[in-house]
């Protein structure tokens, strides 16, 4: 069967997010991907969306991320814009209203996004073959 258009959009957004570092990409996020052994794919996507929402809600106005120049401010705004897009599409793919996020280890945002990209690419290769 054909791949969901949402999945393609997620991969595109993840590519944009992982190509460049910003002041915020070294900050930590709850690493639900490391603790997703006994969860369904939909639950994993739902939890990923949840922790991403927690991240950007917490750091959207974080002065460490906004930086000292208009250039850094612009990059942070772009980062937040992409994270919101990713969050929205992950909810669409998950098809769940809510999901519990247990206490877990922390990962940098950039590592989390790289691993999420790997997961999404694997899913895409399966559905496109």
């Amino acid at each position: 069967h054909k791949c969901d258009i949402t999945l393609q959009e997620i991969i595109k957004t993840l590519n944009s997010l992982t190509e460049q570092k910003t002041l915020c990409t070294k900050l930590t996020i709850t690493d639900i991907l490391a603790a997703s052994k006994n969860t369904t794919e939909k639950e994993t996507f739902c939890r990923a969306a949840t922790v991403l929402r927690q991240f950007y809600s917490h750091h959207e106005k974080d002065t460490r991320c906004l930086g000292a120049t208009a250039q850094q401010f612009h990059r942070h705004k772009q980062l937040i814009r992409f994270l919101k897009r990713l969050d929205r599409n992950l909810w669409g793919l998950a098809g769940l209203n809510s999901c519990p996020v247990k206490e877990a280890n922390q990962s940098t945002l950039e590592n989390f996004l790289e691993r999420l990209k790997t997961i999404m690419r694997e899913k895409y290769s399966k559905c496109s073959s």
Epitope: Q20, T69, A70, Q71, R75
Partner: antibody, heavy 123, light 106 residues
């Protein structure tokens, strides 16, 4: 296709203010994902970034020129402008306007440039 | 301010030769480095962005590599139309251009 066109006087007297305008056609200057810059090149020399302006109106300037530079935007005219005060012969250069940023990336290089306008500072 | 040191300042090579230009940043700039080509009387043209990505429509003989502080720009087989000055530019923290490398045909 987006195009940029610089305009302004080709000759400015020392100690006066150099004023240039860049008109953007084929696209909106108001997009959140893009920003706009000025770069100059003295005759036979290299490129020097002057400053940039973002959709919010916030600006960054080259520290070496900061005290003399003002960049502003007029969204109604789809234009942005450069003012450089107290000019000397060292400000004689080709002045370029350019677009930076991208809708599908966190940031991007200055990828679209105007053809440049020569400004001579002389009495 | 981040300084960009580009070398050589000029070079002469034969058509078909492999040409290499280097650029060194005074501090870590990650992959926020671009390469531009400028022909006499023309505006600079973006060739490579983020150290190694080829801008759309640019011939594949142009390539870039590097990360951190050391970067390389390569023309795999020099063509007559490649005669120009090439500039590196960092945009990790504001913007700084290298001094340029003038490429001529032997």
């Amino acid at each position: 296709q987006l195009q940029l066109q610089e305009s302004g006087p080709g000759l400015v007297k020392p100690s006066e203010t150099l004023s240039l305008t860049c008109t953007v056609s084929g696209g909106s200057i108001s997009s959140e994902s893009y920003y706009w810059g000025w770069i100059r090149q003295p005759p036979g020399k290299g490129l020097e970034w002057i400053g940039s302006i973002y959709y919010s109106g916030s600006t960054d300037y080259n520290p070496s020129l900061k005290s003399r530079v003002t960049i502003s935007v007029d969204t109604s005219k789809n234009q942005f402008s450069l003012k450089l005060s107290s000019v000397t012969a060292a400000d004689t250069a080709v002045y370029y306007c350019a677009r930076g940023g991208a809708s599908d990336r966190i940031d991007h290089a200055f990828d679209i440039w105007g053809q440049g306008t020569m400004v001579t500072v002389s009495s | 301010d981040i300084q960009m040191t580009q070398s050589p300042s000029s070079l002469s090579a034969s058509v078909g030769d492999r040409v290499t230009i280097t650029c060194q940043a005074s501090q870590d700039i990650s992959n926020y480095l671009n390469w531009y080509q400028q022909k006499p009387g023309k505006a600079p043209k973006l060739l490579i962005y983020d150290a190694s990505n080829l801008e759309t429509g640019v011939p594949s003989r142009f390539s870039g590599s590097g990360s951190g502080t050391d970067f390389t720009f390569t023309i795999s087989s020099l063509q007559p139309e490649d005669i120009a000055t090439y500039y590196c530019q960092q945009y990790y923290d504001l913007y700084t251009f290298g001094g340029g490398t003038k490429v001529e045909i032997k």
